[in-house]
Amino acid sequence: KLEAQPFAHLTINATDIPSGSHKVSLSSWYHDRGWAKISNMTFSNGKLIVNQDGFYYLYANICFRHHETSGDLATEYLQLMVYVTKTSIKIPSSHTLMKGGSTKYWSGNSEFHFYSINVGGFFKLRSGEEISIEVSNPSLLDPDQDATYFGAFKVRDID
Amino acid sequence: KLEAQPFAHLTINATDIPSGSHKVSLSSWYHDRGWAKISNMTFSNGKLIVNQDGFYYLYANICFRHHETSGDLATEYLQLMVYVTKTSIKIPSSHTLMKGGSTKYWSGNSEFHFYSINVGGFFKLRSGEEISIEVSNPSLLDPDQDATYFGAFKVRDID
Amino acid sequence: KLEAQPFAHLTINATDIPSGSHKVSLSSWYHDRGWAKISNMTFSNGKLIVNQDGFYYLYANICFRHHETSGDLATEYLQLMVYVTKTSIKIPSSHTLMKGGSTKYWSGNSEFHFYSINVGGFFKLRSGEEISIEVSNPSLLDPDQDATYFGAFKVRDID
């Protein structure tokens, strides 16, 4: 029987979201509760680690929200962005595989604001390579498991 | 051994992006540099050609951006759209499989604007059929390989 | 030979879209015309029913649009949202797997407005579980088959 195809679906752990508005790496994710799950991949130090060479479909869904009860925004002009990055242990450099997002004007005229980003793509990943998620304005992240998550599943071997 | 499953991940070649704000077909894509790759499919004349019947997952990520240093926009009200189309050589007509996008108001009050679209879906494709990408406002495309790309991978055979 | 992998791609049936601006479940979808298709899954009562345990990639693309010829919007501040939900017959409760969308300001200064949402993710589904789509502002849905659709395809078995 073929070795089970690796996959992961990781959902945001909002207990430890950074406070800045700059681009930060999100290191706290669930891998074993609710919709979150992982098989034949490893989650460590905020990174999804590839254990098996292959071509994988990677995806991320990132939701941002603001309610006026959370306080006044420091600026109404926001860059709400996600970057899906790959790091190789052998060559300690980070490369962005996918990016998405939007500039938004979240004015005080509305009491609630929301915006979601979805990205996905097909990439060759080698054992030991690491996938991580960077976002801007992390304190605006929606902490629900259906809102902010990323994942991967292996589609085929490398020839 | 089963024939290796076809796939492609094509990234924008920004050296030849059309000007204008109308809907145009994007014909310049990389297939063999950086994240771009192709196997058991063909890229020719700006189209991704299917070589093997099957059900494929198709996806596209299209990023638009504008910085005030690029000059004034002709209009601040924009339609930023993508259309993933299928053409059959046998029946020379084009059909839109997927579309996405947004109307945007990119005012001069902000020096930078950004917006990304992601679409994806599962389609039956026959050998010889061609997939192409049309966008509005091509001069606003983000030329990075992590920003503007499309792809496909075969999931299963046709019964 | 392995049982053929289940899949579905369902496109909106706009002849029966609810009115109103509240969150509603969309029950009318095509499964056998145009791009719409289904295999080893069942579509019944507005829900996509799983017939085979497994890990599936689920996706949805939802487009909203408004033209001034359709009349004035009741409010220019809109929440345009999609929720992909899973219901288990054994435990009659509904859980949101994925959500996406945006708050939008669709002012009367522009004659046409458009916005699309895309979500996708990898989930364990058991036979008998049902997938459905809820949206806000259903009367603003784009009725084209390339615009508003959802689907699923099985990627691997459950160990």
């Epitope: 508005s21 006044d72 420091a74 600026t75 002009y77 304190s139 605006l140 | - | -």
Partner: antibody, heavy 121, light 107 residues
């Protein structure tokens, strides 16, 4: 470690100008709003001005409005306070302080410099 | 502008005492209140933000409560290091103001 260092203080005659600087290190400066707060000799703290992380929004106390200008250079990790038309009542120790939240106002100031003294006489 | 009034202005206490400082706002500020500690010749130090959230690294003997117009800072058991001046600071509609301060001194 996280640090803010003010400079540019000194003795100046009324009506003259002075520019204070605040050099940041140990955190992503471009991700946080920054304040200037002052303290006259033997008195309490008085808020002076604030600037958002991207520099788009600036707010001032009524006592300095029209005379003081807050600015920042994110490429140099530096905050500035341009003080014009100085008055004797502007005499104080001037502190720069980092916003606890980069996204929201109102969460307090979690990192402070050691202060720089401005004397107007 | 919103005025912040602290009481008392001076408080004499002993090590081990439970100490409470009050801050009143001239109009509602929801929970947008912070508390600071300042020692002579030093910069202020953030203790509490959003009325009741303890800043990282601050001892748990410090706590904050209140909302609207009335707020309190409580030190459950006064330690030698706690003798200092304490300031409340409000935020409301793009304006920040401090209270006049409360000096906690040794009895």
């Amino acid at each position: 470690q996280v640090q803010l260092v003010e400079s540019g203080g000194g003795v100046v005659h009324p009506g003259r100008s002075l520019r204070l600087s605040c050099a940041a290190s140990g955190f992503t400066f471009s991700g946080y709003g920054m304040h200037w707060v002052r303290q006259a000799p033997g008195k309490g703290l008085e808020w002076v001005a604030v600037i958002s992380y991207d520099g788009t929004n600036k707010y001032y106390a009524d006592s300095v409005k029209g005379r003081f200008t807050i600015s920042r250079d994110n490429s140099k990790d530096t905050l500035y306070l341009q003080m014009n038309s100085l008055r004797p009542e502007d005499t104080a120790v001037y502190y720069c302080a980092k916003c606890l939240s980069g996204t929201y106002w109102g969460y307090g100031m979690d990192v402070w410099g050691q202060g720089t003294t401005v004397t107007v006489s | 502008d919103i005025q912040m009034t602290q009481s008392p202005s001076t408080l004499s206490a002993s090590v081990g005492d439970r100490v409470t400082i009050t801050c009143r706002a001239s109009q509602s500020i929801s929970s947008w209140l912070a508390w600071y500690q300042q020692k002579p010749g030093k910069a202020p130090k953030l203790l509490i933000y959003k009325a009741s959230s303890l800043e990282s690294g601050v001892p748990s003997r410090f706590s904050g409560s209140g909302s609207g117009t009335e707020f309190t800072l409580t030190i459950s058991s006064l330690q030698p290091d706690d003798f200092a001046t304490y300031y409340c600071q409000q935020y409301n509609s793009y304006s920040w103001t401090f209270g006049q301060g409360t000096k906690v001194e040794i009895k």
